[in-house]
């Protein structure tokens, strides 16, 4: 029995920040769980982790090079990624594991979300404007 995960197919980070919502076919209320966000087609790099249980507040971990926060809904975890770099454009997969109460559950692999980080292109005013036309 696997948890299903829904993610937006694509998100664009115009201001180097993005909210990625992972929606689950499972209610996380009063559960001990570990939600994580993985970068790359092979999910090789785990970049953010949200750990929650019934007795203490949510704990959020960010891998070095990532600035991450997490928010819990009844059937969702939203990862808020800030200070993203253009080279962090990639596909990101949500993962969830529920440890307690039994049985242990995890998710079917989702389709992932492509996060496209747009660089900030400032248009400077020209230093030497050409001759103005009458």
């Amino acid at each position: 029995n696997k948890i299903l995960v829904k993610q937006s197919p694509m998100l664009v980070a115009y201001d180097n920040a993005v909210n990625l919502s992972c929606k689950y076919s499972y209610n996380l209320f009063s559960r001990e769980f570990r939600a994580s966000l993985h970068k790359g087609l092979d999910s090789a790099v785990e970049v953010c982790v949200v750990y929650g249980n019934y007795s203490q507040q949510l704990q959020v971990y960010s891998k070095t090079g990532f600035n991450c926060d997490g928010k819990l809904g009844n059937e969702s975890v939203t990862f808020y990624l800030q200070n993203l770099y253009v080279n962090q454009t990639d596909i990101y997969f949500c993962k969830i594991e529920v440890m307690y109460p039994p049985p242990y559950l995890d998710n079917e692999k989702s389709n992932g979300t492509i996060i496209h980080v747009k660089g900030k292109h400032l248009c400077p005013s020209p230093l030497f404007p050409g001759p103005s036309k009458p």
Partner: nanobody, 124 residues
Framework: EVQLVESGGGEVQTGGSLRLSCAAS????????MGWFRQAPGKEREFVAA????????DYAESVKGRFTISRDNAKNTVYLEMNSLRAEDTAVYYC?????????????????WGQGTLVTVKP
């Protein structure tokens, strides 16, 4: 709830070796990291080494690189710290830590659970 039990500390001469072990028990997820920190008298607890579950990510403090090796046996939920070429400044209480982060974190605040500590004394 995770419990950590360290062993292997003791007294050794300068240049000697020790192997510390830390066994974890309790509810474990498929990915987590474990690390070693140490605290000398009157000093802050400092990072020594850490390793993730897949054993493809390990990190060391500069002061122990090339002398200490961290490893783990996932079947036994145990992490080891092999300490060679020990120096007087390695004398400290060594603590094992557990984090739900899936990478070898050197940040003390990332660690949720700690062992009781094991004393390592290096005699000149």
């Amino acid at each position: 709830e995770v419990q950590l039990v360290e062993s292997g500390g003791g007294e050794v001469q300068t240049g000697g070796s020790l192997r510390l072990s830390c066994a974890a028990s309790g509810r474990m997820f498929s990915n987590y990291a474990m690390g070693w920190f140490r605290q000398a008298p009157g000093k802050e607890r400092e990072f020594v080494a850490a390793i993730n579950y897949r054993r493809d990510d390990a990190d060391y403090a500069e002061s122990v690189k090339g002398r200490f090796t961290i490893s783990r046996d996932n079947a036994k939920n145990t992490v080891y710290l092999e300490m060679n070429s020990l120096r007087a400044e390695d004398t400290a209480v060594y603590y094992c830590g557990f984090t739900y982060a899936g990478w070898a974190s050197s940040r003390r605040d990332d660690y949720n659970y700690w062992g009781q500590g094991t004393l390592v004394t290096v005699k000149p």
